[in-house]
């Protein structure tokens, strides 16, 4: 809190300009009119104000707008945005994508702060859904943004927005998130032909069910091992050796290196050893010849 002191003679600010960097904190408080500051916010970012000086400018705006800043001021906050608390931001009504971009630019190259997270949350809630332009903007600044959302939040992403998603945006998504995103991606890309469709859907396949993997195996897609290893274990288990061979194409040889890891390990345990031997990879651990496999889960479901 800065003490109220009279502005020294001749120091009253007529405009927001670089001479203000030489003002002490109490001089800024006494000599800069809050309304002048609000109308010339676009100039603040062009001037190298210190941490302490920005504190004073924020205090002036807080007094002028106790219920929250108008968007005309918010858009030009620049580095003053870094001084805002999540509580301050919750008072705002940010509707313009340009305002969002301007504020994200301030924190560019740095990890997502609580202020930025709150801002994004306010913006998305205000829009009602995560539309394509917003998603484009957010993933450009924060590639991991999509994977920071809960499955419930992801459910508000319209399929049309999926076109904005790049493979790297999904790197940190867990299976629960991909379960939500995959059906949206399938819908979004449904009119594409085989090879183009696979290129687009590939990053989302961690949420694909067995029947979709079976369908892909009929299309000569040559899935790489990295993608295969991210598939849901429960979706991979029912696939036959022939289906996995078709799904992976020339990459099938990579199964040997992954035989101790999920989902390959669990899949091997479900296959007949005879069938595994047809791959010629030396995969071991399948069901020995002559053994009968009972699916107890099916039996329990029937009883």
């Amino acid at each position: 809190e800065v003490e109220k002191t009279a502005c020294p003679s001749g120091k009253k600010a007529r405009e927001i300009d670089e001479s203000l960097i030489f003002y002490k904190k109490w001089e800024l408080e006494a000599c800069v009119d809050a309304a002048l500051l609000a109308t010339q916010m676009d100039r603040v970012n062009a001037i190298p104000f210190t941490y302490e000086q920005l504190d004073v400018l924020k205090h002036k705006l807080d007094e002028l707008y106790p219920q929250g800043y108008p968007e005309s001021v918010i858009q030009h906050l620049g580095y003053l945005f870094l001084k805002m608390s999540p509580e301050d931001i919750r008072k705002w009504n940010v509707t313009s994508l340009e305002t969002l971009k301007a504020l994200l630019e301030v924190n560019k190259g740095h990890e997502m702060s609580p202020q930025v997270a709150t801002l994004i949350d306010r913006f998305v809630k205000g829009r009602g859904q995560l539309d394509k332009d917003t998603l484009d903007t957010l993933t450009a600044f924060y590639p991991g943004y999509l994977c920071s959302l809960s499955p419930e939040e992801l459910s508000s992403v319209p399929p049309s927005s999926i076109w904005a998603v790049r493979p790297q945006d999904l790197d940190t998504c867990d299976p629960r998130q991909l379960d939500v995103l995959y059906p949206k991606a399938r819908l979004a890309f449904q009119n594409m032909n085989g090879s183009e469709y696979f290129v687009k859907i590939q990053s989302f396949l961690g949420g694909a069910p067995t029947e979709d993997l079976k369908a892909l195996s009929q299309q000569n897609v040559s899935m790489d091992l990295a993608t295969f290893m991210k598939l849901r274990t429960d979706a991979v288990l029912p696939l036959t050796v022939a289906e996995v061979q078709k799904l992976l194409g020339p990459h099938v040889e990579g199964l040997k290196a992954e035989e101790r890891h999920r989902p390959v390990r669990d899949w091997i345990l479900r296959q007949r050893q005879d069938d595994l031997d047809t791959l010629g990879l030396g995969l071991q651990g399948g069901i020995p010849n002559g053994y009968l496999v009972l699916d107890l889960s099916m039996q329990e479901a029937l009883s």
């Epitope: 670089e18 970012n45 062009a46 001037i47 190298p48 104000f49 210190t50 941490y51 580095y79 870094l82």
Partner: nanobody
């Protein structure tokens, strides 16, 4: 994290000259307003010279006509050319701007002694 590295300080006689440099990681100085500050022993840090993001410059009255701030965007470096140095210019000099200034992150500074 932003890294600020000031250099070029040293011991100089009154009336002498020095050229301070400040290098920053990222593209910080090419897009932001920047300033040089100094802190004499027992004193608070004070601004000496500044350059707005638009390129206009301003100086503290005590250094006007003797110091010149400039920048090289390609090298992401800011300079402070100091001439006609006086004993009262003795201080540790720091540069800053943009995100790190707003967040109160500072470099180690470079020491200037006029004696």
């Amino acid at each position: 994290q932003v890294q600020l590295v000031e250099s070029g300080g040293g011991l100089v006689q009154p009336g002498g000259s020095l050229r301070l440099s400040c290098a920053a990681s990222g593209s910080m100085f090419s897009i932001n307003a920047v300033a040089w500050y100094r802190q004499a022993p027992g004193e608070q840090r004070e601004p000496v010279a500044a350059m707005t993001s638009g390129g206009s410059t301003i100086y503290a009255d005590s250094v006007k006509g003797r110091f010149t701030i400039s920048r090289d965007n390609a090298k992401n470096t800011v300079y402070l050319q100091m001439s006609s140095l006086k004993p009262e210019d003795t201080a540790v000099y720091y540069c800053n701007g943009g995100w790190s200034l707003a967040m109160d992150y500072w470099g180690q500074g470079t020491s200037v002694t006029v004696s």
